[in-house]
């Protein structure tokens, strides 16, 4: 807190300019009018103030706008945004995508800070949903943004926004998140032809059910092993050897290298050994010939 002192004669700031960097903290407090500061925020961004000086400028704005800054000021905060706390940001009402972009630009190249997370949260809540333009913007700055949302938050993403999602945006998503995103992606890409559809849906397949994987196996998609390994285990288990062979196409040979890892390991345990042998890959661990396979889940459903 800077104590109140009178501004020395001739030092009253008429505008925000470079000369202010040589003002001591108490001089900034005494000689810079908060209203002038608010109207010339865009200039502050150009001037290389120290962090200590920025503290004083922030304090002046806080006094002027105790209920939270107006968007006209927020949009021009520039690097003063780095001085804001999540508590400060919770008081804001940010509605313009341009304002959001301007503040994200300040934090570019850094991890998502608590300030940025709060800003995004306020913005998205204000809009009511994650529309395509917002998602485009957020994933451009933070490729992992989508996977930082809870399944509940993801449910507000409209299918149309899925077009903005790139494969790398889903790299850190877990199965629960993909369970929410997959049906939206399926809906978004439903009018595409077979090969184009597969290219688009591929990143979302970690949320696909068995019946969709069976359908894909009929379309000569040649799924790569990396995608196959990300599929839900419960969706892979019911697939037959023939279906997996069709699904993977030439990539089926990669199963051997993954036979000890999920979901391949669990899938092998569910197949007849003689069916696995037809692949000619030397996969071991299937059900020996002559054994009866009981589908207990089916039996439970009948009872």
């Amino acid at each position: 807190e800077v104590e109140k002192t009178a501004c020395p004669s001739g030092k009253k700031a008429r505008e925000i300019d470079e000369s202010l960097i040589f003002y001591k903290k108490w001089e900034l407090e005494a000689c810079v009018d908060a209203a002038l500061l608010a109207t010339q925020m865009d200039r502050v961004n150009a001037i290389p103030f120290t962090y200590e000086q920025l503290d004083v400028l922030k304090h002046k704005l806080d006094e002027l706008y105790p209920q939270g800054y107006p968007e006209s000021v927020i949009q021009h905060l520039g690097y003063l945004f780095l001085k804001m706390s999540p508590e400060d940001i919770r008081k804001w009402n940010v509605t313009s995508l341009e304002t959001l972009k301007a503040l994200l630009e300040v934090n570019k190249g850094h991890e998502m800070s608590p300030q940025v997370a709060t800003l995004i949260d306020r913005f998205v809540k204000g809009r009511g949903q994650l529309d395509k333009d917002t998602l485009d913007t957020l994933t451009a700055f933070y490729p992992g943004y989508l996977c930082s949302l809870s399944p509940e938050e993801l449910s507000s993403v409209p299918p149309s926004s899925i077009w903005a999602v790139r494969p790398q945006d889903l790299d850190t998503c877990d199965p629960r998140q993909l369970d929410v995103l997959y049906p939206k992606a399926r809906l978004a890409f439903q009018n595409m032809n077979g090969s184009e559809y597969f290219v688009k849906i591929q990143s979302f397949l970690g949320g696909a059910p068995t019946e969709d994987l069976k359908a894909l196996s009929q379309q000569n998609v040649s799924m790569d092993l990396a995608t196959f390994m990300k599929l839900r285990t419960d969706a892979v288990l019911p697939l037959t050897v023939a279906e997996v062979q069709k699904l993977l196409g030439p990539h089926v040979e990669g199963l051997k290298a993954e036979e000890r890892h999920r979901p391949v390991r669990d899938w092998i345990l569910r197949q007849r050994q003689d069916d696995l042998d037809t692949l000619g890959l030397g996969l071991q661990g299937g059900i020996p010939n002559g054994y009866l396979v009981l589908d207990l889940s089916m039996q439970e459903a009948l009872s």
Partner: antibody, heavy 121, light 107 residues
């Protein structure tokens, strides 16, 4: 990796001007301030001024006001420092150093290798 | 301008010693202070920023403390590579100013 590479040594006559350049790489040039610091032989460090590469705003120490000019070229991620009306006491190693804005502190975390400027008749 | 006074100007110590260098500001600078190490023919290297934060990659034997006007750099157990000149610097307000330096020599 993040680095600042400065131009080579200079020998100048009194009254002349010298320009030292500092090329940044490995980070977003416009997201950090650049400072110039000099060190006379066997002496301590002296801050000369600062430039904000984003808008070109500058601030110069009183001692160098009117003699120093700092500019930047965003197309080449280079800052330049020109010192005019040279005198023998300007003989020093001149350093550019990065600090502030996008870093977590105003401290100088990256320094150029230094440029020796000798002023001699 | 804010004056930074470093003491002692020079210091002799042995490997393994605990060494303390102090820096005093002529006015309150909060925690806007850095410590640098410089070896002959090379640029300074940032050790400590914001009075007590250790710069990434700097050995933990270096530590900084203080706020307001009095600050300290401590090297808990001197290593051969630590013999150099150390500078404090304030970045509370312009012009930014450095201490006169402390030359740490082998005893």
């Amino acid at each position: 990796q993040v680095q600042l590479v400065q131009s080579g040594a200079e020998v100048k006559k009194p009254g002349a001007s010298v320009e030292v350049s500092c090329k940044a790489s490995g980070y977003t040039f416009t997201s950090y301030y650049m400072h110039w610091v000099r060190q006379a032989p066997g002496q301590g460090l002296e801050w000369m001024g600062i430039i904000n590469p984003s808008g070109g705003s500058t601030g110069y120490a009183q001692k160098f006001q009117g003699r120093v000019t700092m500019t930047r070229d965003t197309s080449t991620s280079t800052v330049h420092m020109e010192l005019s009306s040279l005198r023998s006491e300007d003989t020093a190693v001149y350093y550019c150093a990065r600090g502030g804005y996008s870093s977590s502190s105003d401290a100088f975390d990256i320094w150029g290798q230094g440029t020796m400027v000798t002023v001699s008749s | 301008d804010i004056q930074m006074t470093q003491s002692p100007p020079s210091l002799s110590a042995s490997v393994g010693d605990r060494v303390t260098i102090t820096c005093r500001a002529s006015q309150d600078i909060s925690s806007a202070l850095a410590w640098y190490q410089q070896k002959p023919g090379t640029p300074p290297k940032l050790l400590i920023y914001d009075a007590s934060s250790l710069e990434s990659g700097v050995p933990s034997r270096f530590s900084g403390s203080g706020s307001g006007t009095d600050f300290t750099l401590t090297i808990s157990s001197l290593q051969p590579e630590d013999f150099a000149t150390y500078y404090c610097q304030q970045f509370s307000s312009y012009p930014l100013t450095f201490g006169g330096g402390t030359r740490l020599e082998i005893k």
